[in-house]
Interface confidence: low
């Protein structure tokens, strides 16, 4: 049955849900965080959790500025117990087919099992296979980085172009940007969009003699990726005397489809596989991360995996009350379903993390943008937050206005590393950045009332414009430094937050049927763009747009 992992259809059936509704009505919606701090001197002590990574580095998660008290936290934990979040978690870590609609295991956690403990899917221990792919990645990345691997004219590789989309692009893009400080000898470029501009601009800046193309597609049939890959291949051949034998030195595949890879002309020795139990948005830990290993070096890539593994260990072994990702997920449910919040802001106070919100956007929204439960009924509650974000302090000069004084409740995560990789001007920049990190969370919580505004000299009609309601929730995440291990841990934290939300909402966080319909219709329309006839097969709007496009193209 599709519902073999949970014994409830809707989260609203759970007794703790009703209890939380009542708590929200009686105290949640009027709870003042400022007053909670005044009432409880130990509030910060109780509501901050420190995660210790495998290398001893630490990340502090401060939940104390959230709209909760002891009773609310207890009721949320009760909800997690009733929804059997830990049961589903354990099923995932045992390799059971918790992706029920596609009848697949969800085993990205096995990719970072650097302890090499046995991890089974359908009776097979996958740890040796994962290890052998990583060994292949290590060997290959070290050959390329050292210059031992040479292009067809005997020159060292200087540039890597990763061609992929979705999970085969966003993860590596984000991670290589985040860990730029650890980059070595190679430059990496990423081509994802089918818009010809993306590949055209990239090919302008690389040299065919010193460029390695990675074609990243699980099935090796993704329309955008294969189209871009063929364009890259044609460009390469046109620049290298049209000799297909040169392809072997300049193209590698990150895929599971050996037949299509060989057909494309790539030597299958340069093919890095991964299994059907790795979902695209969870694939940066797999062979899809080869561009990362090439860029920052294999040892750093392994540290990245180990950081995630350390969070996996925390998530599976820590009691619910202190379980950091679980608490993060429960808070998200609290705001989504009881306060009616529809968004979740992630603002990294770190320029290196500028693609982190975009990565989390796919992780969260593709996972939990569902409206049917594991019990095959429509939800009677909101799911899937709209996740957005930009690096601060830039964000403070754009959408923070709405966060502070708008009509919507926007639960926010702020992320900062105490140590900068670039402590320039005697740490002046870092101190300014940090002061904003602390000040924004404080301002959102304390606000500014009418009396303060008047005391500062405002009068008349200007007063309400300068009032800040405060009581706007934030979670502050303070790391020591953004290292590969820290980044791995942060991603895994958000993966398990997403997992917790999905488990409580009783939805399948691991399929993505929503991407299918548009793909199918695009194929149909693609054929219609190949001829000059007037189109009348769609609705009036679609017909009108297609016909205007054809006229202008």
């Amino acid at each position: 049955s599709n519902n073999s992992f949970t014994n409830f259809k809707l989260a609203t059936e759970l007794p703790a849900w009703s209890k939380l509704q009542k708590i929200y009505e009686s105290q949640g919606k009027t709870l003042s965080v400022k007053q909670e701090f005044q009432k409880d001197a130990k509030r910060f002590e109780k509501l901050n959790k420190t995660f210790t990574n495998y290398d001893g580095s630490k990340i502090l998660f401060d939940y104390s500025k959230n709209l909760v008290n002891d009773e609310i936290i207890a009721a949320l934990i009760e909800l997690a117990k009733e929804a059997n979040v830990t049961g589903l978690r354990d099923a995932m870590f045992k390799g059971e087919h918790i992706n029920s609609t596609e009848d697949r295991a969800v085993y990205h956690v096995a990719l970072r099992n650097r302890a090499n403990k046995p991890m089974y899917v359908d009776g097979v221990n996958v740890a040796p296979e994962v290890d052998s792919v990583l060994k292949h990645m290590k060997e290959f990345s070290e050959q390329v980085r050292s210059g031992e691997w040479k292009g067809y004219t005997g020159k060292k590789i200087t540039d890597v172009v990763n061609i992929g989309i979705g999970g085969s692009d966003l993860g590596p893009v984000m991670v290589t940007e985040a860990l730029k400080h650890y980059a070595g000898v190679l430059d990496v470029h990423f081509v994802s969009n089918i818009d010809g501009t993306h590949i055209a601009e990239t090919l302008k800046v690389v040299d065919p003699e010193t460029t390695l193309f990675l074609i990243a597609s699980k099935t090796f049939t993704t329309a955008e990726t294969i189209t871009n890959a063929n364009t890259a291949k044609n460009w390469f051949l046109s620049k290298t005397g049209n000799d297909p034998s040169h392809i072997a030195k300049h193209f590698a595949a990150l895929s599971t489809n050996e037949t299509e890879v060989a057909k494309f002309g790539i030597d299958t020795k340069n093919m890095f596989g991964f299994e059907s139990w790795v979902g695209g948005r969870y694939s940066v830990w797999s062979a899809i991360g080869l561009s990362v290993a090439l860029y920052i070096g294999y040892d750093n890539f392994e540290a990245f995996l180990k950081g995630a593994e350390a969070v996996d260990n925390h998530f599976t072994q820590t009691p619910l009350e202190d379980n950091i990702p679980l608490l993060g997920g429960l808070l998200s449910v609290w705001y989504n379903n009881f306060f009616g919040a529809q968004t979740h802001l992630v603002a990294p106070f770190d320029q290196y993390l500028h693609r982190f919100p975009a990565y989390l956007q796919q992780l969260s929204m593709e996972s939990n943008g569902k409206s049917v439960t594991r019990g095959n009924v429509f939800t009677d509650y909101s799911t899937g937050s709209i996740l957005f974000g930009e690096p601060a302090t830039n964000a403070q000069h754009s959408f923070f206005q709405l966060v502070h004084q708008g009509t919507k409740l926007i639960p926010s995560d702020f992320i900062l590393a105490a140590q900068s990789h670039n402590p320039i001007e005697n740490k002046l920049h870092q101190k300014m950045l940090a002061s904003n990190f602390f000040a924004q969370a404080e301002a959102l919580m304390v606000g500014k009332d009418e009396e303060q505004v008047k005391a500062e000299g405002a009068t008349g009609g200007l007063v309400p414009h300068k009032v800040f309601s405060g009581n706007r929730p934030t979670t502050s995440i303070l790391a020591q430094k953004i290292t590969p291990a820290t980044l791995g841990a942060l991603i895994a934290y958000y993966e398990h937050v997403t997992f917790t939300e999905g488990a409580i909402w009783n939805i399948n966080s691991f399929d993505q049927w929503g991407v299918e319909l548009g793909k199918v219709l695009a194929k149909v329309i693609g054929k219609e763009l190949d001829n000059s006839s007037t189109i009348s097969t769609h609705d009036a709007s679609t017909n009108g747009l297609i016909n205007q496009f054809k006229e202008w193209m």
Epitope: E13, S371, G375, V377, F378, D380
Partner: nanobody, 119 residues
């Protein structure tokens, strides 16, 4: 837009019964949460009972065991059977429809029906 029309209110003696109905102007099959709220003079509107499309029901502690909510999707109607009425049940009773899933964000209220419990 969905119009909600409540009926069935009136004057009743303590210990008596009433059955409130709320008719929606369109199908309620996918509109998952339908509920009753009430507002007594000088007080805030409070939750009384709710019923989801998944078949689960929920009640305020003060009415548990006395009130029963039910819905008839075929008739686009939700009912509130009120037994053992007490003077403190006197209020205007409002029907609420909250859409989720594909209809998330829809939230409609009826105009209310007066219930007075008095001897």
């Amino acid at each position: 837009q969905v119009q909600l029309v409540e009926s069935g209110g009136g004057l009743v003696q303590p210990g008596g019964s009433l059955r409130l109905s709320c008719a929606a102007s369109r199908s309620i099959v996918t509109i998952n949460v339908m509920g009753w709220y009430r507002q007594a003079p000088g007080k805030e509107r409070e939750f009384v009972a709710g019923a989801t499309s998944g078949g689960s029901t929920d009640y305020a502690d003060s009415v548990k065991g006395r009130f029963t909510i039910s819905r008839d999707n075929a008739k686009n109607t939700v009912y509130l059977q009120m037994n053992s009425l007490k003077p403190e049940d006197t209020a205007v009773y409002y029907c609420n429809l909250r859409g989720t899933g594909y209809n998330y964000g829809e939230n409609y209220w009826g105009k209310g029906t007066q219930v007075t419990v008095s001897s």
